[in-house]
Amino acid sequence: SERCDDWGLDTMRQIQVFEDEPARIKCPLFEHFLKFNYSTAHSAGLTLIWYWTRQDRDLEEPINFRLPENRISKEKDVLWFRPTLLNDTGNYTCMLRNTTYCSKVAFPLEVVQKDSCFNSPMKLPVHKLYIEYGIQRITCPNVDGYFPSSVKPTITWYMGCYKIQNFNNVIPEGMNLSFLIALISNNGNYTCVVTYPENGRTFHLTRTLTVKVVGSPKNAVPPVIHSPNDHVVYEKEPGEELLIPCTVYFSFLMDSRNEVWWTIDGKKPDDITIDVTINESISHSRTEDETRTQILSIKKVTSEDLKRSYVCHARSAKGEVAKAAKVKQKVPAPRYTVELACGFGAT
């Protein structure tokens, strides 16, 4: 056959679906690779063809669209499973072609099993809620297009294994789950089960997401430098190792880039000739506030080094701060024998 633009296996779109549930999978060509949509392609006389390679096989084969109850069907640029089976796992290819044009892409589809508490190998999206912030909601994800707006599904929400059926703090409201106040105890996996009828059959869609309760913007502050501070003086003799920790607390801020850096005499350590190393460690609180520690180390400090200015800097979306470390050369204690000799008037 003639040449075809092959976009290869699109592993960025590792699609996971639950066994025995409906799945609708859009051909990725129109979403990520081509500059036109399916309608334009269709009206231009292009045809969309689907085929697949079973798991652990090399042979490409056509998809069987003649299964009982139309278990697998195609509608426009969507491949439908009503429902999926475990052995539907494999690499699926959609190819758009006519006599003069051809473009195709493959993508992996994994059909996943879940247990009665919705545990599975499925990768879960994470939804962050601000702690004690007022009403916040999560929405049952990826259910658009499964049933028409005239169909009213029933939606049941679970936290872990437990059905949420009261409204003391977390209120199930159809596709939404409303948190009157988000608390650390609300951290966990939330599952919505959407049940809807279609052609005399009942289908279930299961969607699980992880809720992570994080620091509230109401409580966010600019970075706080705990060290260096005015109470600690780094007093060293030449030849000793100089270790200065810069410890900075950052409030959680959505999508904020937290930065810590040292300057020595106003320059970045990379831009000066002294032999300095910097090691960084990061820790997080339960609400994802961050503490970063950068330890500046000079193995054998010189008297010149002890005269330099060492400043720790920190920056977040809330602001920038800096603090200088108090570094000084230790004055050597007078030697006992000399002192004694002077005391007796010896010359």
Epitope: E132, Y162, I171, L180, I181
Partner: antibody
């Protein structure tokens, strides 16, 4: 476990009053909301608002409250209070506090105070 | 705002009989409804919540059904101790507000 209410009584129109609700047998903590409901003589129940007993003390009020009533809580004293101000005769009612547990296993208002009567009259 | 409409009131039945109380919400409140029993001079007592969950210590003679905007409380095998006023409570959130709204109450008279 009980909610003991105090602070009701006779008050003149335009006046103020503070009603309180003390937890006994359990301590008010981040596990609870304290809510207030009132009932005019011979009438039905009317929700006033709720306050979260945890650190933020977040509050929700019924629209009709319009800033006249204020919820507060003192975790150390294990007490929730309702400050009533700009009172009118229409505020004459039995005022109840109720507990709501922050979990998925109990209903809203699983424990109620005995009620305290507020009478607004000149 | 959310409006809860309760019917009928009063309702009466003989001991051993069955009574049904209806509660209608002005908005779709899904299953966010509770039922309370109140006797004269006493605070309300939680009976059921979340549609179908009995509160602790409540006998199984009490049952409820419904979701969305139409709800029903049924008391079967009526006993003289069931004489009381029954209230539904609906909960609804909208943007940053939460509405807890009681129905007007239904008095149950046991003959």
């Amino acid at each position: 476990q009980q909610l003991e209410q105090s602070g009701g009584g006779l008050v003149k129109p335009g006046g103020s009053l503070e009603l309180c609700c003390k937890a006994s047998g359990f301590s008010l903590s981040s596990s609870y909301w304290i809510c207030w409901v009132r009932q005019a003589p011979g009438k039905g129940l009317e929700w006033i608002g709720c306050i979260y007993a945890g650190s933020s003390g977040s509050t929700y009020y019924a629209n009709w409250v319009n800033g006249r009533f204020t919820l507060s809580r003192d975790i150390d004293q294990s007490t929730g209070c309702l400050q009533l101000s700009s009172l009118t005769a229409a505020d004459t009612a039995m005022y109840y506090c109720a507990r709501s547990i922050v979990d998925f296993s109990s209903g809203w208002g699983d424990l109620w105070g005995q009620g305290t009567l507020v009478t607004v009259s000149s | 705002a959310l409006v809860m409409t309760q019917t009928p009131s009063p309702v009466s039945a003989a001991v051993g009989g069955t009574v049904t109380i209806n509660c209608q919400a002005s908005e779709d409140i899904y299953s966010n409804l509770a039922w309370y029993q109140q006797k004269p001079g006493q605070p309300p007592k939680l009976l059921m919540y979340g549609v179908s969950t009995l509160a602790s210590g409540v006998p199984s003679r009490f049952s409820d059904s419904g979701s969305g905007t139409e709800f029903t409380l049924t008391i079967s095998g009526l006993q003289s101790d069931d004489a009381a006023t029954y209230y539904c409570l609906g909960v609804y959130t909208y943007i940053s507000d939460v509405y807890y709204t009681f129905g007007g109450g239904t008095e149950v008279v046991v003959k």
